[in-house]
Each structure stands twice: as structure tokens, then as C-alpha cells.
């Protein structure tokens, strides 16, 4: 019998200073590139070693980015979201959603559209 897998969702404001090589992360998602079923949100898919985000330490792979400098990322095309980050300036404020897996009992099966696991 599978145990229940619960998720603890928290939000955090992360202020990054753009480094010599930029912010130092990759994203997936957007209205034209939904990776998570029924969710066109923007997700962090890679934190680059020694980049600004990695050195700050708070942003994690799998985090959902809700806004950049107060601008909502809902219903954006993937490239429009990318451009928003690239044009965000030197000091960048990110509102992010962390989704932590909390395991109860035996390991449950992860659904295809589930971004965690």
C-alpha cells in the first residue's frame, strides 16, 4: 500500500544582485511550453554553479517564480518570461514558491504532471 505524499508550499521574496555572468539559472514553462500539467507557470530548472542564485543559496531547482520586480509571470509566453529576466536590471526581486515534499508512510507514485520527485 502506498503512503500519502503531501507538499508544504511556502512563498519567499528573494533579492538577487546580477553577477558578472548574470543571475545564474534556467527556467522552463510558459503558456506555450507547459511542462507541468494545467500549469503555465515559470519554474527554475537549473541553478548554475557559482552564479548569483547559487551564491545566494535560497532559489532552488523546482521553485516556481511568481513575479520579477513585482511583475506577475502568469500567462506569459516562454520567451517573454526569459526576456523579462534578461531586462530586469542589476537588482532583481523574485517572488518564489517553494514546494517541499513531505513523505508520509511508504513511497507513493509520482504522477506525470507533478513537478516534484
Amino acid at each position: 500500500m502506498n503512503g500519502r505524499v503531501d507538499y508544504l508550499v511556502t512563498e519567499e521574496e528573494i533579492n538577487l544582485t546580477r553577477g558578472p555572468s548574470g543571475l545564474g539559472f534556467n527556467i522552463v514553462g510558459g503558456t506555450d511550453q507547459q511542462y507541468v500539467s494545467n500549469d503555465s507557470g515559470i519554474y527554475v530548472s537549473r541553478i548554475k554553479e557559482n552564479g548569483a542564485a547559487a551564491l545566494d543559496g535560497r532559489l532552488q531547482e523546482g521553485d516556481k517564480i511568481l513575479s520579477v520586480n513585482g511583475q506577475d509571470l502568469k500567462n506569459l509566453l516562454h520567451q517573454d518570461a526569459v526576456d523579462l529576466f534578461r531586462n530586469a536590471g542589476y537588482a532583481v526581486s523574485l517572488r518564489v514558491q517553494h514546494r517541499l515534499q513531505v513523505q508520509n508512510g511508504p513511497i507513493g507514485h509520482r504522477g506525470e504532471g507533478d513537478p516534484s520527485g
Epitope: G22, F25, N26, Y35, S45, R46, K48, E61, R86, R99
Partner: nanobody, 132 residues
């Protein structure tokens, strides 16, 4: 973190075929489908070199000139596995073959391809020996 385990290597005669597999164990909160995957190889006394790569979505594949037309990289996200099918093997294909992974998607800083650099996670390798 991502743990990578390669298999499928072995001894094969020139002209033969091998299919290498790499299974990824992905940490909680992450998913295999977000990772670009690559194969590299290192022959005795030589530097490690790029062989092939596939983007996180599977939509883009890249090959070194030395294996182009003889090898196919593919992935099965449901099985957390990437494959390298190698045909018409030559003695010069003899090497330890390594699987590598890195988060895919688009850099928020600059455009770059899925090719030969910036991999974050590496397997232990599987030996491929091609005899005359």
C-alpha cells in the same frame, strides 16, 4: 542532486552494435524531464570528449562529428533513462563512456546550446571495447 548509473558496455567486434543506458535517480523536488542529458567518452591516454546530447524536452539532439550517422541518442522520461545506440562500431570507439546531466530549459542570462559544456552531474562510466 542527480545520481547517474551507466550500463550496456562490453566487448564487441568492429562493425557491431551496442546500446548504452543511463538511469537517473533524481532528488525530491526535481524531475528527470527537466534535465539535458549527454554522453561523453574517454579513451586511454586521451581527454574526455563529447559524444552526443539531448535536450530536456527531447526536441533537440547533438552529435560529435566522429559518431554522426552511426549513433542515436534518445530518452524515456517515464523511465528516467537516456540511451545511446551505437552502430558500425570501430576500434577507435574504444573508451569509457560517461553519462552526464544538467538542468535544461532556457538560461535567463544568455542563449547557449545543449552541446558540449556545463554539465553538473556525472556517472561513473561504462567500458566499451571494440576489437578488430
Amino acid at each position: 542532486d542527480v545520481q547517474l548509473v551507466e550500463s550496456g558496455g562490453g566487448l564487441v567486434q568492429a562493425g557491431g552494435s551496442l546500446r548504452l543506458s543511463c538511469v537517473a535517480s533524481v532528488a525530491s523536488g526535481r524531475t528527470f524531464g527537466w534535465y539535458d542529458m549527454g554522453w561523453f567518452r574517454q579513451a586511454p591516454g586521451k581527454e574526455r570528449e563529447f559524444v552526443a546530447a539531448i535536450s530536456w524536452s527531447g526536441g533537440s539532439t547533438y552529435y560529435a562529428d566522429s559518431v554522426k550517422g552511426r549513433s542515436t541518442i534518445s530518452r524515456d522520461n517515464a523511465k528516467n533513462t537516456v540511451y545511446l545506440q551505437m552502430n558500425s562500431l570501430k576500434p577507435e570507439d574504444t573508451a569509457v563512456y560517461y553519462c552526464a546531466a544538467r538542468g535544461g530549459g532556457t538560461s535567463v542570462d544568455s542563449d547557449y546550446d545543449v552541446g558540449e559544456f556545463e554539465y553538473d552531474y556525472w556517472g561513473q562510466g561504462t567500458q566499451v571495447t571494440v576489437s578488430e
